[in-house]
Interface confidence: low
């Protein structure tokens, strides 16, 4: 990794042991100021591998609400608007970081957690296994 | 929202003001033990809207490495393996939370940051604007 010189104005950290505990400011800085949030909002319907979005809520997690994509079809939508089962709709997954309250129900103490979410679906050529 | 009774064993928080500062344990708990990491690894190549993955590294961010998807084509791959420009390859984007070192170069002090990443691509029917 890259070695970064320590800033002398850093808050003092007394816990030098792992698991490492750090201070996190929850006042979110949003870097997405130039993006239009509605830009990809209709892709789930217009895609040849359309998907539905399911709300996953967990008050012990931050963010508490995560939207999960579920592909609508096994196949993909063809030019005629029918499902073509020679192709497959598959979920595109991504590992994301969330904060989990630890100990439970604590407002100011969290642990980083990695979870896998399905963001949307894409249409792929199936893997065909030929039997000898 | 859901009201959660406070756990009496929570660490004491002296800073009651916003921006809210919390303690976060960076020893990541991975909830993805049941998933096969190779499961969706080749979708970027098999998709009708294939994409390339670009490495985005920032030592002041946690995680420091994020992979960004860039669609290979403007159109989508048809059954003959050619690009069909009557359809569009578009990125599926997701807002994710990352930790930004703040003040810069501090190992134990972060701020939550929301960034938009492209996770993969999907093939969509274009929106056709009819000119009167």
């Amino acid at each position: 990794g890259i070695t970064i010189p320590r800033n002398p104005g850093c808050p003092n950290s007394e816990d030098k042991n792992f698991p490492r505990t750090v201070m996190v400011n929850l006042n979110i800085h949003n870097r997405n100021t130039n993006t239009n949030p509605k830009r990809s909002s209709d892709y789930y319907n217009r895609s040849t591998s359309p998907w539905n979005l399911h709300r996953n809520e967990d008050p012990e997690r931050y963010p508490s609400v995560i939207w999960e994509a579920k592909c609508r079809h096994l196949g993909c939508i063809n030019a005629d608007g029918n499902v073509d089962y020679h192709m497959n709709s598959v979920p595109i997954q991504q590992e994301i970081l969330v904060l989990r309250r630890e100990p439970p129900h604590c407002p100011n103490s969290f642990r980083l957690e990695k979870i896998l979410v399905s963001v949307g679906c894409t249409c792929v050529t199936p893997i065909v296994h030929h039997v000898a | 929202g859901i009201t959660i009774p406070r756990n009496p064993g929570c660490p004491n928080s002296e800073d009651k003001n916003f921006p809210r500062t919390v303690m976060v344990n960076l020893n990541i708990h991975n909830r993805n033990t049941n998933t096969n990491p190779k499961r969706s690894s080749d979708y970027y190549n098999r998709s009708t809207s294939p994409w390339n993955l670009h490495r985005n590294e920032d030592p002041e961010r946690y995680p420091s490495v994020i992979w960004e998807a860039k669609c290979r084509h403007l159109g989508c791959i048809n059954a003959d393996g050619n690009v069909d420009y009557h359809m569009n390859s578009v990125p599926i984007q997701q807002e994710i939370l990352v930790l930004r070192r703040e003040p810069p170069h501090c190992p134990n002090s972060f701020r939550l940051e929301k960034i938009l990443v492209s996770v993969g691509c999907t093939c969509v029917t274009p929106i056709v604007h009819h000119v009167a």
């Epitope: 996953n56 609508r72 096994l74 | -």
Partner: nanobody, 123 residues
Framework: QVQLVESGGGLVQAGGSLRLSCAAS????????MGWFRQAPGKEREFVAA????????KYADSVKGRFTMSRDNAKKQVYLEMNSLKPEDTAVYYC????????????????WGQGTQVTVSS
């Protein structure tokens, strides 16, 4: 680690009935549905039925519609397959599995299968 234990199979005469059970443990919080699949000797594994944990909605293969009924018990994390009017062509090893992406999840998405339970229908 997901663990799937199927039971309830056996030998039955054509026209008879059987009830299969599947106990699932280690499912992720995002588990969406459960499915029954079967594999007859010399044939590929095929979809039989599926049920949503959330809504209880079901889906069946055309070959079993009207004869098989799938149900669930969320508290026990168990699913069942009630098989009536059995035919010799229903003879197969029956497997259950998690369907994390809905009732249309493809079988090649699965990393793990249980031992299955043998169903034999004699004529």
């Amino acid at each position: 680690q997901v663990q799937l234990v199927e039971s309830g199979g056996g030998l039955v005469q054509a026209g008879g009935s059987l009830r299969l059970s599947c106990a699932a443990s280690g499912l992720t919080a995002s588990s969406y549905a459960m499915g029954w699949f079967r594999q007859a000797p010399g044939k590929e594994r095929e979809f039989v039925a599926a049920i949503s944990w959330i809504s209880g909605g079901t889906k069946y293969a055309d070959s079993v519609k009207g004869r098989f009924t799938m149900s669930r018990d969320n508290a026990k994390k168990q699913v069942y397959l009630e098989m009536n009017s059995l035919k010799p062509e229903d003879t197969a090893v029956y497997y259950c599995n998690d369907m994390p992406y809905g009732l249309d999840t493809r079988m090649d998405e699965y990393a793990y299968w249980g031992q299955g339970t043998q169903v034999t229908v004699s004529s």
